[in-house]
Interface confidence: medium
C-alpha cells in the first residue's frame, strides 16, 4: 500500500508588516520531504500579487518548485533548500510571511503535523526541545460541549528525546484527578480526556524537557453545558405549496433535537363546521407517524400523490422529545387542471407546482 505525502500546508501570516527575525517560522524538514509553506492574507483580506523569495532572490517556478499566491511547495527537498524564505507583496515588497527552513540530512520521521515524530536519538542536531509545528500551536482556547472527547497535543522533538508531563492549573495532572481518568500517549505527545464535564475546565500545560532545556505550552479548556431543549424546526419549513389537481406534492420538515425526537404529520380538518374543539385545540388527523420501519429521514418528508381538492388545507409538522413539542404549519392550495388555467398562466398570476 503506497501512500502520498501530506498536503496540509504550514505557516501563517505575520501579525505585523515586516516581522522581526524572532517572529519568523522556524521549520525543520527531512531530506526528500516536500517543503510546504503557506501565507494566508493578513486578516483574511485580499492579498494582491505576491512573490516568493529565498535568501533575497526571487524563486523561479519549476517542476520541483511550485509557486502559488499563498503557497509554496519545494518537492524532494535537499540541504541546499535550507534558508530564509519570505512571501512579499509584489508591488511594495512588503514582507507578509517569513520562514526559516532547515532541511536535515536524515529523512524526517514523516507527518510532523500529527506531532508523532519517531522519538529517536539520531545523533544529529543534539539540543534543547523544540515544537515541530509551532505555527499550529497559536490557538490555545478549546470550547467543547460536555460529554465529548478532548485531546491536547504538544508535538515536539529534541535530542535526546524529550520527556513530556502535564499540569492542570499549574499542578501535576494525573489520571486519578478526574472521573474517567486520562490517557497519556508519550509517543503522540498527547493527553486525552473522554466525556468531559464542567469540572474539567481549566488550563492544561504540557512541559517538554531534556537535559538541554525545557519548553511549555498552555491550553485552556472550556466545557459547555448542553441545555436540553425541545426540538428545533428549520425556519421556512414546511413551505406553502400551490399544486395542480392530480399532481404530486412534498412537504419538508427539518428537525434538530439532542434527545430522540418523535415526528408526526397532521392535517387540519373540520368537525361539524368547526376547526377547533371546545378547548381551542385544533381538529387534526394524523397522516404520518413513526413506525417500526420508519426512519427520521423518511418522517421529515410528507408526500401527497395525485392530489385532489380535498387535499387542500393546512398541514402541520409536529416534533416532540422528552423536553417538549414544536410545530410548523403550511398550506396547500389545489388548482384546477392545466387546460383550465391557460388564461391565468398567460396573465402570469398562477404557478403550478
Amino acid at each position: 500500500e503506497s501512500l502520498g505525502t501530506e498536503q496540509r500546508v504550514v505557516g501563517r501570516a505575520a501579525e505585523v508588516p515586516g516581522p522581526e527575525p524572532g517572529q519568523q517560522e522556524q521549520l525543520v524538514f527531512g531530506s526528500g520531504d516536500a517543503v510546504e509553506l503557506s501565507c494566508p492574507p493578513p486578516g483574511g483580506g485580499p492579498m494582491g500579487p505576491t512573490v516568493w523569495v529565498k535568501d533575497g532572490t526571487g524563486l523561479v517556478p519549476s517542476e520541483r518548485v511550485l509557486v502559488g499566491p499563498q503557497r509554496l511547495q519545494v518537492l524532494n527537498a535537499s540541504h541546499e533548500d535550507s534558508g530564509a524564505y519570505s512571501c512579499r507583496q509584489r508591488l511594495t515588497q512588503r514582507v507578509l510571511c517569513h520562514f526559516s527552513v532547515r532541511v536535515t540530512d536524515a529523512p524526517s520521521s514523516g507527518d510532523d503535523e500529527d506531532g508523532e515524530d519517531e522519538a529517536e536519538d539520531t545523533g544529529v542536531d543534539t539540543g534543547a526541545p523544540y515544537w515541530t509545528r509551532p505555527e499550529r500551536m497559536d490557538k490555545k482556547l478549546l470550547a467543547v460541549p460536555a460529554a465529548n472527547t478532548v485531546r491536547f497535543r504538544c508535538p515536539a522533538a529534541g535530542n535526546p528525546t524529550p520527556s513530556i508531563s502535564w499540569l492542570k492549573n499549574g499542578r501535576e495532572f494525573r489520571g486519578e484527578h478526574r472521573i474517567g481518568g486520562i490517557k497519556l500517549r508519550h509517543q503522540q505527545w498527547s493527553l486525552v480526556m473522554e466525556s468531559v464535564v464542567p469540572s474539567d475546565r481549566g488550563n492544561y500545560t504540557c512541559v517538554v524537557e531534556n537535559k538541554f532545556g525545557s519548553i511549555r505550552q498552555t491550553y485552556t479548556l472550556d466545557v459547555l453545558e448542553r441545555s436540553p431543549h425541545r426540538p428545533i424546526l428549520q425556519a421556512g419549513l414546511p413551505a406553502n405549496q400551490t399544486a395542480v389537481l392530480g399532481s404530486d406534492v412534498e412537504f419538508h420538515c427539518k428537525v434538530y433535537s439532542d434527545a430522540q425526537p418523535h415526528i408526526q404529520w397532521l392535517k387540519h380538518v373540520e368537525v361539524n363546521g368547526s376547526k377547533v374543539g371546545p378547548d381551542g385545540t385544533p381538529y387534526v388527523t394524523v397522516l404520518k407517524t413513526a413506525g417500526a420501519n420508519t426512519t427520521d429521514k423518511e418522517l421529515e418528508v410528507l408526500s401527497l400523490h395525485n392530489v385532489t381538492f380535498e387535499d387542500a388545507g393546512e398541514y402541520t409538522c409536529l416534533a416532540g422529545n422528552s423536553i417538549g413539542f414544536s410545530h410548523h404549519s403550511a398550506w396547500l392550495v389545489v388548482l384546477p387542471a392545466e387546460e383550465e388555467l391557460v388564461e391565468a398562466d398567460e396573465a402570469g398570476s398562477v404557478y403550478a407546482g
Partner: antibody, heavy 127, light 110 residues
C-alpha cells in the same frame, strides 16, 4: 439518522473520468473529516483520500495522486471524488466515510476511525 | 503488500476466544491510534474498535482491542456464528501521511 449515500459510479473506459458524490445527512457535515476508501473485488480495503472540514488539508494515496481530486461542498453537505486517467486497477467499490468528532489542539488528524460508512458505489474501468 | 500485516485467516468454534494480530511499525501503530473494522459479507465496513481499545456504542464487550509497541490485536470472546466476517486493522501512518489498512483477516466460525 446519520447517513452517507454515494453515487456516480459506473462503467468507464481506461483513461476516462468519473465524478463520485457522497451526500451526507443527519450530522453537521462541515465539522467532520471525510475520507474515500475503496475495495477492489475480492480484495481488502484501501484508503484513497481524506479532506479536513475547513478544506485546508488534503491527503491522497500515492496510487491516485495526480489523478484523483477530493473536494467538499459544505453548503450542500456533499463530498466529491473527481477521478481522471482511470486505470483497470481503479476498479472497486468506493466508500465514503466520516471520522467521529474529536476536539483537539493543535487541530489535526484524530485517527479515531471511520465511524460511519456509505453503502458504496461500484466503479468499473474496462475497455 | 499491506503496510500493516494481519494473518489472512483465523477460525474458532462457537464460545471460543479468538485473537487476530496486526503488526506495523513505529510510524503507524507505534505512534498512532489503532482502529479495527468488521466487514460482514456484502456490507460496508463497520468501526469496531477506536483509539486502540475503545468500543463505539453498540459494539458488544465481547470485542476488545489492545496494543503493545508496534503490534495490536483484536480479541473476540464467546465467539458467535454472526461474527464470521473480515476484520481489518488500520492506523494513520506518519511517514506516509496516509491512513493504512491491514490486508484483512477472514474469520470463520466452525
Amino acid at each position: 439518522e446519520v447517513q452517507l449515500l454515494e453515487s456516480g459510479g459506473g462503467l468507464v473506459q481506461p483513461g476516462g473520468s468519473l465524478r463520485l458524490s457522497c451526500a451526507a445527512s443527519g450530522f453537521t457535515f462541515s465539522s467532520y473529516y471525510m475520507s474515500w476508501v475503496r475495495q477492489a473485488p475480492g480484495k481488502g480495503l484501501e484508503w484513497v483520500s481524506g479532506i479536513y472540514p475547513d478544506d485546508g488539508s488534503i491527503y491522497y494515496a500515492d496510487s491516485v495522486k495526480g489523478r484523483f481530486t477530493i473536494s467538499r461542498d459544505n453548503s450542500k453537505n456533499t463530498l466529491y471524488l473527481q477521478m481522471n486517467s482511470l486505470r483497470a486497477e481503479d476498479t472497486a467499490v468506493y466508500y465514503c466515510a466520516k471520522d467521529p468528532l474529536i476536539y483537539e489542539l493543535p487541530i489535526g488528524y484524530s485517527s479515531y476511525g471511520m465511524d460511519v460508512w456509505g453503502q458504496g458505489t461500484l466503479v468499473t474501468v474496462s475497455s | 503488500q499491506s503496510v500493516l500485516t494481519q494473518p489472512p485467516s483465523a477460525s474458532g468454534t462457537p464460545g471460543q476466544r479468538v485473537t487476530i494480530s496486526c503488526s506495523g511499525s513505529s510510524s503507524n501503530i507505534g505512534s498512532n491510534d489503532v482502529n479495527w473494522y468488521q466487514q460482514l459479507p456484502g456490507t460496508a465496513p463497520k468501526l469496531l474498535i477506536y483509539y486502540d481499545s475503545n468500543r463505539p456504542s453498540g459494539v458488544p464487550d465481547r470485542f476488545s482491542g489492545s496494543k503493545s509497541g508496534t503490534s495490536a490485536s483484536l480479541a473476540i470472546s464467546g465467539l458467535r456464528s454472526e461474527d464470521e466476517a473480515d476484520y481489518y486493522c488500520a492506523a494513520w501512518d506518519s511517514s506516509l501521511s496516509g491512513y493504512v489498512f491491514g490486508g484483512g483477516t477472514k474469520l470463520t466460525v466452525l
